[in-house]
Interface confidence: low
């Protein structure tokens, strides 16, 4: 049975086996086409989601689709139902929390009262002044809190207490990539992790431990990537994995927050990377213990210099490392998070590509998560 499962796939109606290598090859080998059903699927970027959260205290903003202008949500008459609608528009299914925060002196958007129309937030037509003088601060999910704060050093062994959202993504029980828990159903990782194996069956997620082999594996229901853009082959290196059963959160299994849409990190901002990747550039061996390292944002202009990445780093990517080198992510860390701590931890980047590991001024290149919030929300909404 184990051998059969490893090398063959069972088609239904009529029952017969086909070689496993014929799964997800673009050809319908089973009469009903089920060999092409459980495969990595692409999902278009989709329409603009009409709500977003700002780094200014996680305040809610709503899009006026008629004018294309964004407005800040006034706290007047804002209800739990409206909070749930806002979060559902972003694809969240959990119970949100919200509170009033004072309108700041540098508030640059018009503030409007919010209502609901066919399960979408709208601006109230006859919106007068915001009498409460407050904006809506909204949290769709409790995220980005860990039991332990890491110490700022070069590279050291990590504890799952510090990074409860880190997962190992495995194919046939072998660690292939890192990933981050975003909510009970969803894990964020890199699309290039699935280049070799596009069938969903053999992919598993392991969560809740900092040791590679020591935790139970979770079945994957779907793997979703963005449509490939041949003009920018390294762009869109982002994937979402939907778990078959929702995770139960605990001290060692928790979600990390998505970044705010306006999360612009300036050069030298401190960030963290983690992973079980190779400890030496040319192979070495996979680390059994989760490793963590502090790095910093490296200016994209410097990163794109003609003696560096020569313009290959697009606006949907970001660079991070340390100026004197020696700290970087490496093969096997792909898909893992590049993290920023404000009040909570946010996954601002996904380990994507780079040349060599830990080279002086040779930063890692990361998928900029804030550039893909719209896509993430659209995927989640489609799967609600």
């Amino acid at each position: 049975k184990v051998i059969l499962d490893k090398y063959y796939f069972l088609c239904g109606q009529p029952l017969h086996f086909i070689p496993r290598k014929q799964l997800c090859d673009g050809e319908l080998d089973c009469p009903l086409g089920e060999d092409e059903e459980h495969c990595v699927k692409s999902f278009p970027e989709g329409p603009a989601v009409a709500v977003r959260l700002s780094k200014d205290r996680s305040t809610l903003q709503v899009l006026d689709s008629a004018t294309g202008n964004w407005f800040s949500a006034c706290f007047d008459n804002f209800t739990e139902a409206l909070a749930e609608t806002a979060c559902r528009q972003m694809g969240y299914s959990s119970k949100p929390t919200f509170r009033a925060v004072e309108i700041g002196p540098d508030q640059d958007l018009d503030v409007v009262e919010i209502t609901e129309n066919s399960q979408e937030l709208r601006m109230r037509n006859s919106s007068g002044p915001c009498l409460s003088g407050s904006l809506v601060s909204l949290h769709c999910l409790a995220c980005g809190k860990s039991l332990k704060t890491p110490r700022v050093v070069g590279v050291e062994e990590a504890s799952v207490d510090s990074w409860p959202w880190q997962v190992s993504i495995q194919y046939d029980k072998q660690h292939v990539c890192g990933g981050s828990i975003l909510d009970p159903h969803w894990v964020l990782t890199a699309a290039h992790c699935f280049r070799k194996h596009t069938d969903v069956f053999n992919w598993k997620v392991r969560a809740g431990s900092d040791k590679l082999g020591s935790f139970p594996s979770l079945a994957v229901a779907k793997i979703i990537i963005i449509e490939f853009n041949p003009m920018y082959p390294k762009d869109n290196d982002i994937a979402l994995m939907k778990l078959q059963f929702p995770l139960t959160f605990s001290g060692t299994v928790r979600p990390i927050c998505l970044p705010f849409f306006d999360e612009e990190l300036t050069p030298a901002t401190p960030l963290w990377i983690i992973g079980w990747g190779f400890t030496k550039q040319n192979g070495g061996k996979m680390s059994d213990i989760l490793l963590q390292a502090s790095v910093q944002v490296i200016d994209s202009t410097r990163c794109n210099a003609d003696d560096a990445y020569q313009g290959e780093v697009t606006e949907k990517m970001m660079c991070a490392g340390i100026p004197e080198g020696g700290v970087d992510t490496c093969q096997g860390d792909s898909g893992g998070p590049l993290m920023y701590q404000s009040d909570q931890w946010h996954v601002v980047g996904i380990v994507s590509w780079g040349y060599g590991c830990g080279g002086p001024s040779t930063p890692g290149v990361y998928t900029k998560v804030s550039a893909y919030l719209n896509w993430i929300y659209n995927v989640w909404k489609a799967e609600l």
């Epitope: 030496k280 003696d307 020569q310 100026p323 004197e324 020696g326 002086p360 001024s361």
Partner: antibody, heavy 120, light 107 residues
């Protein structure tokens, strides 16, 4: 200004090992990769490998794998290249060369070269 | 490994001539190509990096062009001090291979 000063010429017997040093000055030693390139008499240039002086990680050309070891001593800003099991075809001038700043960048600064002669 | 093929292997020219040396990579190397000049008994000297960027201090009569697999080094007006051997080198992938060299001699 940037300077790379290499150790003096060596004459070695076949089967022996040689260790060439390259002392760097005029810049932050740990911020730039150091490459080793050799040139046999009357021949072209041959890239041997590279060391990251910050972490000490290395990448060697397959041809030299198992015979070459590149190390560094940050306290003296010196990199070393040791080649073992020497044979006559290893007779060459060995150069250390500093990258312009990135792993894949061109070699902007070169040492004066060290002639290693292997006699049988 | 990526093979780098230079042509010609040697060439004779006179002072004032315009000279072109080509370098072909066995696979695409984007713009990861450098050109070096070497004189007898001396270490190589970097002329051009990133296929077309002139290293500071190098005279503007030297120029580089190309991307992908085909690259060119051009000396617009040969000077007496330009007679030397020229090498191309790819740094797209380790090992960072060199071309076999082009010896530029006085006619």
């Amino acid at each position: 200004q940037v300077q790379l000063v290499q150790s003096g010429a060596e004459v070695k017997k076949s089967g022996a090992s040689v260790k060439v040093s390259c002392k760097a000055s005029g810049y932050t030693f740990t911020s730039y990769y150091m490459h080793w390139v050799r040139q046999a008499p009357g021949q072209g240039l041959e890239w041997m490998g590279v060391i990251n002086p910050s972490g000490g990680t290395t990448s060697y050309a397959q041809k030299f794998q198992g015979r070459v070891t590149m190390t560094r001593e940050t306290s003296t800003s010196t990199v070393y290249m040791e080649l073992s099991s020497l044979r006559s075809e290893d007779t060459a001038v060995y150069y250390c060369a500093r990258g312009r700043g990135w792993l894949r960048s061109a070699l902007g600064y070169w040492g004066q070269g060290t002639l290693v002669t292997v006699s049988s | 490994d990526i093979q780098m093929t230079q042509s010609p292997s040697s060439l004779s020219a006179s002072v004032g001539d315009r000279v072109t040396i080509t370098c072909r990579a066995s696979q695409s190397i984007s713009s990861w190509l450098a050109w070096y000049q070497q004189k007898p008994g001396k270490a190589p000297k970097l002329l051009i990096y990133a296929a077309s960027t002139l290293q500071s201090g190098v005279p503007s009569r030297f120029s580089g062009s190309g991307s992908g697999t085909d690259f060119t080094l051009t000396i617009s007006s040969l000077q007496p001090e330009d007679f030397a051997t020229y090498y191309c080198q790819q740094s797209y992938n380790t090992p960072y291979t060199f071309g076999q060299g082009t010896k530029l001699e006085i006619k």
